[in-house]
């Protein structure tokens, strides 16, 4: 049934990136107002982003309490005044969002190369450990503490004066690669969980190459 | 005429439960959100929670989340405020409201119910 | 949250003269699309439920006297009471309904100088 003159929300998309997550829907608002609710599926309806004007809903509070569970959202369109003087008192319209699970399916956001240091051919370079939404005791967790081996980085890595690129792979933070001494490279990394079947690689972090400021990857 | 009756406050130890109601006449209740405000002793109004004409959706101030569960009957015309876990900063008149022109636009207030929580 | 900003806290005003009472929210609760303020003024007498004078900043809910008015926009507002009649003194309040947990000033005494 559903109260005249609203209209269902419809396109409703999950907007995550480590674990910050937004429902996004159409359309935009007019004469009417939504309210979303979020549920694991063996748990109750809780209502987020009450009477709302706005077409996204962070839900990031809710889904880092358990990121592994699977979560459904719906949103409920209710029109824009009290039902007496707008339409009936029927089941308000509604549509649901497409499950979701944030450890499975949540973006992983660009990383960042921390520091690279060598010693004779070695290089050691390290990646930041960003920092989540999610929380354990109070303390905001990192990426590797919520993922651990499931969460691996690949380095790609070539000399400045070279566009043959090489590639190394880690399950930790730090990369120990050979290298030709005299010679200064360039490093790129990218997150990645080889055991997903979406979203298992993160764009590539910002270019870093020794002996210069941040430089760009050139084919 | 609107009228908005509420009932079930009381004085109460910390930690134990009290269940308000409010009794609404003269409109048609199952079309109106309504909410829960609270006005402690000389102090200003707070807002505690909303329900929505159907029901379904509820929110609530974070002061009341998880202790407080507002829900209504439509077939009786009554909105009820079940509070646990009671604590001294709970002592307050509450007062039930009805969703006026806009959600949130109170056109109408019960005269309210003393909810006092003391050992 | 929203947080609303009443001044003065009190007021003492000579009958027949003009109270004015501001109140500012921390973020604006103008909704561009209709261009409507979502705030709302209420009166609250001793021992009674506060009473809505005016919502959507400006607009005088049915049966309020047109000494009382509201002006605005976005995180500034003014309730003025034109002329103080005896039966005005009370505690004036403003609220936010843009967005939620809905918040109210702390409240503004008027009083009969």
């Known amino acids: 049934s559903g109260t005249t003159n609203t209209v269902a929300a419809y396109n409703l998309t999950w907007k995550s990136t480590n674990f910050k997550t937004i429902l996004e829907w159409e359309p935009k608002p007019v004469n009417q107002v939504y309210t979303v609710q979020i549920s694991t599926k063996s748990g109750d309806w809780k209502s987020k982003c009450f009477y709302t004007t706005d077409t996204e809903c962070d839900l990031t509070d809710e889904i880092v309490k358990d990121v592994k569970q699977t979560y459904l959202a719906r949103v409920f369109s209710y029109p824009a005044g009290n039902v007496e003087s707008t339409g009936s008192a029927g089941e308000p319209l509604y549509e649901n969002s497409p499950e979701f699970t944030p450890y499975l399916e949540t973006n992983l956001g660009q990383p960042t190369i921390q520091s690279f240091e060598q010693v004779g051919t070695k290089v050691n370079v390290t990646v930041e450990d960003e920092r989540t939404l999610v929380r354990k005791n109070g303390t905001f967790l990192t990426l590797r503490q919520v993922f651990g081996n499931d969460l691996g980085y690949i380095l790609t890595y070539r000399k400045s004066s070279s566009s043959g690129k090489k590639t190394a792979k880690t399950n930790t933070n730090e990369f120990l690669i050979d290298v030709d001494k005299g010679e200064n490279y360039c490093f790129s990394v990218q997150a990645v969980i080889p055991s997903r079947t979406v979203n298992r690689k993160s764009t590539d972090s910002p270019v870093e190459c020794m002996g210069q400021e941040k430089g760009e990857f050139r084919e | 005429q609107v009228q908005l009756v509420e009932s079930g406050g009381g004085v109460v130890q910390p930690g134990r439960s009290l269940r308000l109601s409010c009794a609404a006449s003269g409109f048609t209740f199952r079309s109106y959100g309504m909410h829960w405000v609270r006005q402690a002793p000389g102090k200003g109004l707070e807002w505690v929670a909303v329900i929505t004409y159907d029901g379904i959706n509820k929110y609530y101030a974070d002061s009341v989340e998880g202790r407080f569960t507002i829900s209504r009957d439509n077939s009786k015309n009554t909105l009820y405020l079940q509070m646990n876990s009671l604590r001294a900063e709970d002592t307050a008149v509450y007062y039930c409201?009805?969703?006026?022109?806009?959600?949130?636009?109170?056109?109408?207030w019960g005269q309210g119910t003393l909810v006092t929580v003391s050992s | 949250d929203i947080v609303m900003t009443q001044s003065p806290d009190s007021l003492a005003v000579s009958l027949g003269e003009r109270a004015t009472i501001n109140c500012k929210s921390s973020q604006s609760v103008l909704f561009s699309s209709n261009n409507k303020n979502y705030l709302a003024w209420y009166q609250q007498k001793p021992g009674q439920p506060p009473k809505l004078l005016i919502y959507w900043a400006s607009t005088r809910e049915s049966g309020v006297p047109d000494r009382f008015s509201g002006s605005g926009s976005g995180t500034d507002f003014t309730l003025t009471i034109s002329s103080l009649q005896a039966e005005d003194v009370a505690v004036y309040y403003c609220q936010q309904f843009h967005s939620y947990p809905l918040t109210f000033g702390g409240g503004t005494k008027v009083e009969i100088k």
């Open positions: 409201a009805r969703d006026g022109v806009y959600y949130g636009v109170y056109d109408y």
